[in-house]
Amino acid sequence: EVEKTACPSGKKAREIDESLIFYKKWELEACVDAALLATQMDRVNAIPFTYEQLDVLKHKLDELYPQGYPESVIQHLGYLFLKMSPEDIRKWNVTSLETLKALLEVNKGHEMSPQVATLIDRFVKGRGQLDKDTLDTLTAFYPGYLCSLSPEELSSVPPSSIWAVRPQDLDTCDPRQLDVLYPKARLAFQNMNGSEYFVKIQSFLGGAPTEDLKALSQQNVSMDLATFMKLRTDAVLPLTVAEVQKLLGPHVEGLKAEERHRPVRDWILRQRQDDLDTLGLGLQGGIPNGYLVLDLSMQEALS
């Protein structure tokens, strides 16, 4: 409405404060200076503006910063961050972990939105790698964050960052992701003693090769069945009955309940029935006595 484009007398905003909360949309547009808003962004969240009013404030910032907001403004966006589109965020250059934390806090309790995903992507790309502090922050807000990365993206995670990873952060990781993370974890925890090492490495073992599982079986680690069931099938198959018994310790009895599920099922099929019987668990399906087992894969490798 043409007559409403000028700010009414006495309504020009000198500060961003609660005197503005009942301004109509056009009054905010006409009476709030964008530069003033930018310098006082930290006040916006303390003022109960309606969502329409927030839209107006965003529009003002967009006009002031068509190439993207400076970090001094981004850090104080608060609820206004929820109004940003991924396209808006791609224009930003966020370098401070404090800024990242402030924006993640706004979205806390919600699933990772496209805005948050874009923000994290911009931040990590800007840093060049997922350092420990960043990973610590991201997994604190989004426990599944690590498992949302591709194996290629995970390759940029330095071993030192692995210390920030909690078991629950790996819950949704698939074997390809664990294949990348396991060697990093092995490197990160290499100076720990046996029992402490196992506690730390346990969550990553879904990426462990056969030789490492064999080594663990010599250390009385007592791996639980939940961890065993997440191991790579190809890594479990070459293990002997004696090695699995040592690896699981008292938990070996749990094999019976899992005998129809991979990798236990496939492992049983590779073992001599005689050897399985030594466990006294009633596991069936092993290779009958007197049968010769030819490892064709080994034969092919030699020829």
């Epitope: 609660e18 009942f22 969502y51 609820y79």
Partner: antibody, heavy 122, light 107 residues
């Protein structure tokens, strides 16, 4: 306990005045924007007036602008509505209501007074 | 100002029925719509905020959905205490506005 206790309604002649009060307890009164919502007999709800937590900013519906004044005394945890130049169409039950959040940007009411009837009639 | 229109203005239903009330805004209000229940002689009571979030203490038979301009309040299995008038309210912009109400009566 958390509550809003209203007083001050009654019968008044057209052109007359009345002051409604709303005493709050059980929450930090000064942190919350407060409103008056009215309901004419057999009709729906109308947001009449609102005031910010500090009292520094006020809102009035066009239907009452210039005649009603909202105010608050945070030291007494009390909200007021001064109604002047009353008309027959102002006859309604008036409710005071608390905005749900101290911060944030949601505007809905999670706590209401019981209401007080204002009748404007000669 | 944003106008909020409720339908129907009244409905008759029986205990156990599934009841649906709709609310339409004159422009898009995202998910900033709230629902209240009012019984005769009483103040309104908040049921649903932000279109679909159930207010603490409200029975789970009440649910809300919608975004943009069209919203719905559903009572999955009507109980005797649910016979009342229901109002929607938009909180996207000033002035806050209410629907005209839907009276749910006993069939």
């Amino acid at each position: 306990q958390v509550q809003l206790v209203q007083s001050g309604g009654g019968l008044v002649q057209p052109g007359g005045s009345l002051r409604l009060s709303c005493a709050a307890s059980g929450f930090t009164f000064s942190s919350y924007a407060m409103s008056w919502v009215r309901q004419a007999p057999g009709k729906g709800l109308e947001w009449v007036s609102a005031i910010s937590g500090s009292g520094g900013s006020t809102y009035y519906a066009d239907s009452v602008k210039g005649r009603f004044t909202i105010s608050r005394d945070n030291s007494k945890n009390t909200l007021y509505l001064q109604m002047n130049s009353l008309r027959a169409e102002d006859t309604a039950v008036y409710y005071c209501a608390k905005r749900e959040a101290a911060a944030g940007h949601d505007w809905y009411f999670d706590l209401w007074g019981r209401g007080t009837l204002v009748t404007v009639s000669s | 100002d944003i106008r909020v229109t409720q339908s129907p203005s009244s409905l008759s239903a029986s205990v156990g029925d599934r009841v649906t009330i709709t609310c339409r805004a004159s422009q898009s209000i995202s998910s900033y719509l709230n629902w209240y229940q009012q019984k005769p002689g009483k103040a309104p009571k908040l049921l649903i905020y932000a279109a679909s979030s159930l207010q603490s203490g409200v029975p789970s038979r009440f649910s809300g959905s919608g975004s943009g301009t069209d919203f719905t309040l559903t009572i999955s299995s009507l109980q005797p205490e649910d016979f009342a008038t229901y109002y929607c309210q938009q909180s996207y912009s000033i002035p806050l506005t209410f629907g005209q109400g839907t009276k749910v009566e006993i069939k």
